[in-house]
Interface confidence: medium
């Protein structure tokens, strides 16, 4: 079941899914001047069985002026830099392996991909929040939101996070923070403060999570 809405907006915070539940869809969107090839996939879909999850389909973009070329997959370094720093994706992670069963990792970029990713989350998806650069977490409750089904309707739980405008930041050492998007909402899923996993195991982020998953730009 798809979640009706996006995760809640928290002022001066961004969110990220560490892994995507099976059934999650990612729009195949192209940057300005490019379009999805006519025979190309409309979206990527996280699918799998009990032991293995992966993204079905590949997104392909071509120049809007050219109807037949089908360039795809890895962007060049200059194209990589065009992606907005709010996205905090990790190209180093394998596409088809997730630390949680029944979940997919962040899909790798494709050539001429749009600067924003639109995911369609499913019930049970968890996302994690973190204050943007220049703000720190005032209240460190569970900084996460879960899409739940209640009385036949989907809703996101409210994350217990308040970001206050102080120069001191709540980053982990050596970590670079994302910038807030111009409209004040995440341009895509971004990084987080993790307190639980999908299995509700209490974790200490700095100790258990690799900082590579929080990189703000493609290397």
């Amino acid at each position: 079941e798809l979640c009706d809405d996006d995760p809640p907006e928290i002022p001066h915070a961004t969110f990220k899914a560490m892994a995507y539940k099976e059934g999650t869809m990612l729009n195949c969107e192209c940057k300005r001047g490019f379009r999805r090839i006519k025979s190309g996939s409309l979206y990527m879909l996280c699918t799998g069985n009990s032991s293995h999850s992966s993204w079905d389909n590949q997104c392909q973009c071509t120049s809007s002026a050219t109807r037949n070329t089908t360039k795809q997959v890895t962007p060049q370094p200059e194209e990589q830099k065009e992606r907005k720093t709010t996205e905090m994706q990790s190209p180093m992670q394998p596409v088809d392996q997730a630390s949680l069963p029944g979940h997919c990792r962040e899909p790798p970029p494709w050539e001429n991909e749009a600067t924003e990713r639109i995911y369609h989350f499913v019930v049970g998806q968890m996302v994690y929040y973190q204050c943007v650069q220049g703000y720190r977490a005032l209240h460190r409750g569970p900084a996460e939101s879960v899409c739940k089904m209640t009385h036949g309707k989907t809703r996101w739980t409210q994350p217990q996070l308040i970001c206050t405008g102080e120069m001191e930041t709540s980053q982990f050492p050596g970590e670079e923070k994302p910038q807030a998007s111009p409209e004040g909402r995440p341009e895509s899923e971004t990084s987080c403060l993790v307190t639980t996993t999908d299995f509700q195991i209490q974790t200490e982020m700095a100790a258990t999570m690799e900082t590579s998953i929080f990189t703000t730009e493609y290397q």
Epitope: L2, D4, M25, Y43, A114
Partner: nanobody
Framework: QVQLQESGGGLVQAGDSLRLSCAAS????????LAWYRQAPGKEREFLAA???????FYANSVEGRFTISRDNPKNTVHLQMDGLKPEDTAVYYC?????????????????WGQGTQVTVAS
């Protein structure tokens, strides 16, 4: 409550152009596609075009090249520019909002519908 309100329909001559608009309200439409359908008398409702938040588009073969869908996100509005209209384009045109990624949505699966606006193309 979600509301979709179409406007811009009317009577035109064959070969003319018309621009339909649809104002969406009542929720955030970021995770929704906005789409246009039409229904001619005695026929099934027919998918025409859809557009995502990031301007990813999908067209029915019958209108690709003649119709252009566009979206104004700050205003939650979607437009359908119809050029080279033909008498067979005469129908009630419906705006629709559908959760999920851009795809050629089947009419029964659509989450929200507008009331429709009549377009008549005279020969």
């Amino acid at each position: 409550q979600v509301q979709l309100q179409e406007s811009g329909g009317g009577l035109v001559q064959a070969g003319d152009s018309l621009r339909l608009s649809c104002a969406a309200s009542g929720r955030s439409f970021r995770n929704y596609i906005l789409a246009w359908y039409r229904q001619a008398p005695g026929k099934e409702r027919e998918f025409l075009a859809a557009i995502s938040w990031l301007d990813g588009t999908f067209y029915a073969n019958s209108v690709e090249g003649r119709f252009t869908i566009s979206r104004d996100n700050p205003k939650n509005t979607v437009h359908l520019q119809m050029d080279g209209l033909k008498p067979e384009d005469t129908a009630v045109y419906y705006c629709a909002a559908d959760r999920g990624p851009v795809r050629p949505v089947l009419a029964p699966d659509v989450d929200y519908w507008g009331q429709g606006t009549q377009v008549t193309v005279a020969s």
